[in-house]
């Protein structure tokens, strides 16, 4: 998944040019949370550009005209986030992805299911059937590879497979694939940002050809939640709104270029164990981006927190698109029936922001909130299974998911880090329709259980939003379906990325992680229409809630009783998710376990850093932040490499209930080597503006834990400076459990909030 960055940067292919498709990824994919509800911003599902290998043909010799670029995760080789100097995924050596490293980019990525694979076997169309896994309901539709957690399309898988994401380079540095994709379709910018100009490749014109002029454009990887199905090929986004094809930024695990990988091929980044079964899910009726196709993805959960840096958010609109990272799921897995709507709104993955730092212009009269909204998908739902009433209320607001096309939810599989086998289709397209009823208000993050891959499905709202279903894996224990509370498993493995795109270096300012247009295997960008405004009922409940589940029942009580203790300094704690140090590549999809030894969260940077697999941060650390008093202004989460993040165990979940959290120190969690994120061409980089989260007391942040931080604002504030929350990305969870002080603090905050009637 693209790493959230404060600045939008283009991730460049390690080798220079990946086989990027024509589709151009636009500015970082960012998730916008509607104040009233999380909306998904479709992740761009463009294959990452694969650096040319020594034996590679001319870079860019291959051109891609894909409407949407597969996410970058296709690339097998781990992608390193190079966008920020010195920000490469820690411990993961930046490896260039050799040409062809992504199967998706090669057009041979893993398909959402193995159904078709047997010769003579009648392939089952995943779309035909609806499967409920682990209590998660998937709407009918093709199994989506929902590797894009925040964005639709599993490749990943949530989106279709996409090329793995190339390492980022500072914007403007990304080489363009001269021969690469001709034109990469742009996400429906208007859907997300409305007036933002589209910088991406021309939308696909009639005949499926991209509009001229963008021909040589390099796919720019946008910051995208790559948890979305990356493994599946980029889904074709039919212009749902504004006639623009939504681009999902799902990234797929590395897969063979141009081939959706049918069976999960163990890859370091790719999910070693891919769920072969696809669960067909019918897409909700309604115009939507193409159905996402599911891909097999490890069950591990990755949190995709996509924060739209500097994107002005219309608070009035619940329609803002939050990139939704779909959790990679087994092909059969579909988006769970979320009580809270998974990010319904399709995220404009490809909306190029000139600097990507520039906030999208907000409608006049509406306060612009730049707060990146992290959308966490909550796997566990309310006991009723729908999540809190707010969520339910939200559901009404959410338009039924529409599938413009069958877009694969990209849940690209990521080869194990370093794995260079792009053949695995990181993201097979899978449609991850989200039940229209499911409130979009709360996105649920499902943590993947085990290494078994769960397909991530993108859900496409009727409004044309692509939605990514989180992996069907059971919700992490302790998670409750609270309304508006988003739980983020700390360690959900990133969703596979979308198929690699044609080898075009991402343009500057664009991240090359998804740089290649969605390779066939990568879901194309999906247009995500802003989710419908959620009922105002949600707002009242929007209280920043940070709850830290007590480790033990007794501990919880004790915490409540414990007087607030100064929080341990979280300063200088950098948890680099995706850093090799913290990442453990487990064969089932290259889980990345991030252990933050330092408790100081102040300086934790969360980079979802691997570009290739960044797509695979399904549910990876999506944090639903209702920006209110919470001042997260300096927390930067880079979701850089999601490849290995795929396997972030959804550890303890922490809800911060306190209305106002001051994280004084910058917490930057660097998630992720993207080496294995290769999945995802098209894997969008997530850029998360840093916000300061001041923990008055030192708290331990265990990225391994799936601590969920739910920020609920009692009221959607019209605050135009949502910066406080805008950059908070928690790919790593804060383990409140380990910090009684935090727990106490949370309790106190909760009490204060209660007193305030919040």
């Amino acid at each position: 998944m693209a790493e959230p960055r404060q600045e939008f940067e283009v991730m460049e292919d390690h080798a220079g040019t990946y086989g990027l498709g024509d589709r151009k990824d636009q500015g970082g994919y960012t998730m916008h949370q509607d104040q009233e509800g999380d909306t998904d911003a479709g992740l761009k599902e463009s294959p990452l550009q694969t650096p040319t290998e020594d034996g590679s043909e001319e870079p860019g010799s291959e051109t891609s005209d894909a409407k949407s670029t597969p996410t970058a995760e296709d690339v097998t080789a781990p992608l390193v986030d190079e966008g920020a100097p010195g920000k490469q995924a820690a411990a993961q050596p930046h490896t260039e992805i050799p040409e062809g490293t992504t199967a998706e980019e090669a057009g041979i990525g893993d398909t959402p299911s193995l159904e078709d694979e047997a010769a003579g076997h009648v392939t089952q169309e995943p779309e035909s059937g609806k499967v409920v896994q682990e209590g998660f309901l998937r709407e009918p539709g093709p199994p989506g590879l929902s590797h894009q957690l925040m964005s639709g399309m599993p490749g990943a898988p949530l989106l279709p497979e996409g090329p793995r994401e190339a390492t980022r380079q500072p914007s403007g540095t990304g080489p363009e694939d001269t021969e690469g994709g001709r034109h990469a379709p742009e996400l429906l910018k208007h859907q997300l940002l409305g007036d933002l100009h589209q910088e991406g490749p021309p939308l696909k014109g009639a005949g499926g050809k991209e509009r001229p002029g963008s021909k040589e454009e390099v796919d720019e990887d946008r910051d995208v939640d790559e948890s979305s199905p990356q493994d599946s090929p980029p889904s074709k986004a039919s212009p749902a709104q504004d006639g623009r094809p939504p681009q999902t930024a799902a990234r797929e695990a590395t897969s063979i270029p141009g081939f959706p990988a049918e069976g999960a091929i163990p890859l370091p980044v790719d999910f070693l164990s891919k769920v072969s079964t696809e669960i067909p899910a019918s897409e909700p009726d309604g115009p939507s981006v193409g159905r996402a196709k599911g891909q097999d993805a490890p069950l591990e959960f990755t949190f995709h927190v996509e924060i739209t840096p500097n994107v002005q958010k219309e608070q009035a609109h619940s329609e803002e698109h939050l990139g939704r990272a779909a959790f990679p799921g087994a092909p059969g897995e579909g988006p769970e029936a979320r009580g809270p709507s998974l990010g319904e709104d399709t995220k404009e993955a490809d909306l190029p922001e000139p600097s990507e730092k520039q906030p999208a212009a907000a409608p006049r009269g509406k306060p612009v909130s730049r707060v990146p909204q992290l959308k966490a998908r909550m796997v566990s739902k309310s006991k009723d299974g729908t999540g809190s009433d707010d969520k339910k209320a939200k559901t009404s607001t959410r338009s039924s998911a529409k599938t413009l096309k069958n877009r694969p939810c990209l849940s690209p599989k990521h080869p194990t880090p370093g794995s260079s086998d792009p053949l695995i289709q990181p993201s097979s397209p899978a449609v991850c329709p989200e039940p229209p009823s499911s409130p979009k208000y709360v996105s649920s993050v499902t943590s993947r259980t085990g290494s078994s891959g769960a397909k991530e499905m993108k859900l496409k709202g009727a409004d044309g939003k692509t939605k990514i279903a989180t992996p069907r894996g059971a919700a992490p224990p302790g998670q409750k379906g609270q309304a508006n509370a988003t739980r983020i498993p700390a360690k959900t493995p990133p969703a596979p990325k979308t198929p690699p795109s044609s080898g075009e270096p991402p343009k500057s300012g664009d991240r090359s992680g998804y740089s290649s247009p969605g390779s066939p295997g990568t879901p194309g960008s999906r247009s995500r229409t802003p989710s419908l405004p959620t009922p105002p009922t949600r707002e009242p409940k929007k209280v920043a809630v940070v709850r830290t589940p007590p480790k033990s029942p007794s501990s919880a009580k004790s915490r409540l009783q414990t007087a607030p203790v100064p929080m341990p300094d979280l300063k200088n704690v950098k948890s680099k998710i995706g850093s090799t140090e913290n990442l453990k590549h487990q064969p089932g999809g290259g889980k990345v376990q991030i252990i933050n030894k330092k408790l100081d969260l102040s300086n934790v940077q969360s980079k979802c850093g691997s570009k290739d697999n960044i797509k695979h941060v399904p549910g990876g650390g999506s944090v639903q932040i209702v920006y209110k008093p919470v001042d997260l202004s300096k927390v930067t989460s880079k979701c850089g490499s999601l490849g290995n993040i795929h396997h972030k165990p959804g550890g303890g979940q922490v809800e911060v209930k306190s209305e106002k959290l001051d994280f004084k120190d910058r917490v930057q969690s660097k998630i992720g080597s993207l080496d294995n994120i290769t999945h995802v061409p098209g894997g969008g980089n997530k850029k998360i503006e840093t916000h300061k989260l001041t923990f008055r007391e030192n708290a331990k942040a265990k990225t391994d834990h799936g601590a969920e931080i739910v920020y609920k604002s009692p009221v959607v504030s019209g605050d135009t400076s949502p910066r406080h929350l805008s950059n908070v990305s928690s790919t790593g969870s804060i383990d409140m459990v380990d910090s009684p002080q935090l727990a106490t603090l949370a309790d106190e905050v909760s009490a204060s909030l209660a007193k305030q009637g919040l």
Epitope: E62, K67, S68, D110, F259, A292, P520
Partner: antibody, heavy 117, light 109 residues
Framework: QVQLQQSGTELAKPGASVKLSCKAS????????MHWIKQRPGQGLEWIGY????????KYNQNFRDKATLTADESSNSAYMQLNSLTYEDSAVYYC??????????WGQGTTLTVSS | QAVVTQESALTTSPGETVTLTCRSS?????????ANWVQEKPDHLFTGLIG???NRAPGVPARFSGSLIGDKAALTITGAQTEDEAIYFC?????????FGGGTKLTVL
């Protein structure tokens, strides 16, 4: 069963354009890449490009960038390749091949294009 | 552009094991080349056998296997059968395009 049915033999004149079709059945069309390969008599196979029907993502061999245009129609589960400005050298057998899970697993029977004045 | 080289012809006997190789002009073949092996039988009947170096396509007999041998991709047919007589093409991915080899005509006598 997975099948790729390609259009029949095409006869065209130099400078003309032709659109070859490849109708897929037996699988979810959008889940796989569709590649197009050219085989000229006495020569090997030459990869033209591929399209991912889900999002119409295409990638071309640079050599065919100006020659071929790949499209897909999900409604008909068909992939198309339009060849422009035909020359004699475009005479060949063109194959569509489904690719997924790292393999070019299923191929069409091929469409023979003859460019002749 | 890279050139992919294959043996022009090989002959084997039923039950024998035969290995076809695929060399890249650009250097060693790696998994990143996603070596694919395609079988062509008379009348332009192509069937994908192996992809991603060693992934057998569905329905392909287990006697077909792919691997990397030295710096080359290899297709090994263990226990060749008469019906395996065909032309085998190797395809390698080079970051931005697929390059097919000239094909190896395998004769099973």
């Amino acid at each position: 069963q997975v099948q790729l049915q390609q259009s029949g033999t095409e006869l065209a004149k130099p400078g003309a354009s032709v659109k070859l079709s490849c109708k897929a059945s037996g699988y979810t069309f959008t889940h796989y890449w569709m590649h197009w390969i050219k085989q000229r008599p006495g020569q090997g196979l030459e990869w033209i490009g591929y399209i991912y029907p889900t999002n119409d993502y295409t990638k071309y061999n640079q050599n065919f960038r100006d020659k071929a245009t790949l499209t897909a129609d999900e409604s008909s589960n068909s992939a198309y390749m339009q060849l422009n400005s035909l020359t004699y050298e475009d005479s060949a057998v063109y194959y569509c091949a489904r690719a997924g899970n790292r393999v070019f697993d299923f191929w069409g029977q091929g469409t023979t294009l003859t460019v002749s004045s | 552009q890279a050139v992919v080289t294959q043996e022009s012809a090989l002959t084997t006997s039923p039950g024998e094991t035969v290995t076809l190789t695929c060399r890249s002009s650009t250097g060693a073949v790696t998994t990143s080349n996603f070596a694919n092996w395609v079988q062509e039988k008379p009348d332009h009947l192509f069937t994908g056998l192996i992809g991603g170096t060693n992934n057998r396509a569905p329905g392909v007999p287990a006697r077909f296997s792919g691997s990397l041998i030295g710096d080359k991709a290899a297709l090994t047919i263990t226990g060749a059968q008469t019906e395996d007589e065909a032309i085998y093409f190797c395809a390698l991915w080079y970051s931005n395009l697929w390059v097919f080899g000239g094909g190896t005509k395998l004769t099973v006598l």
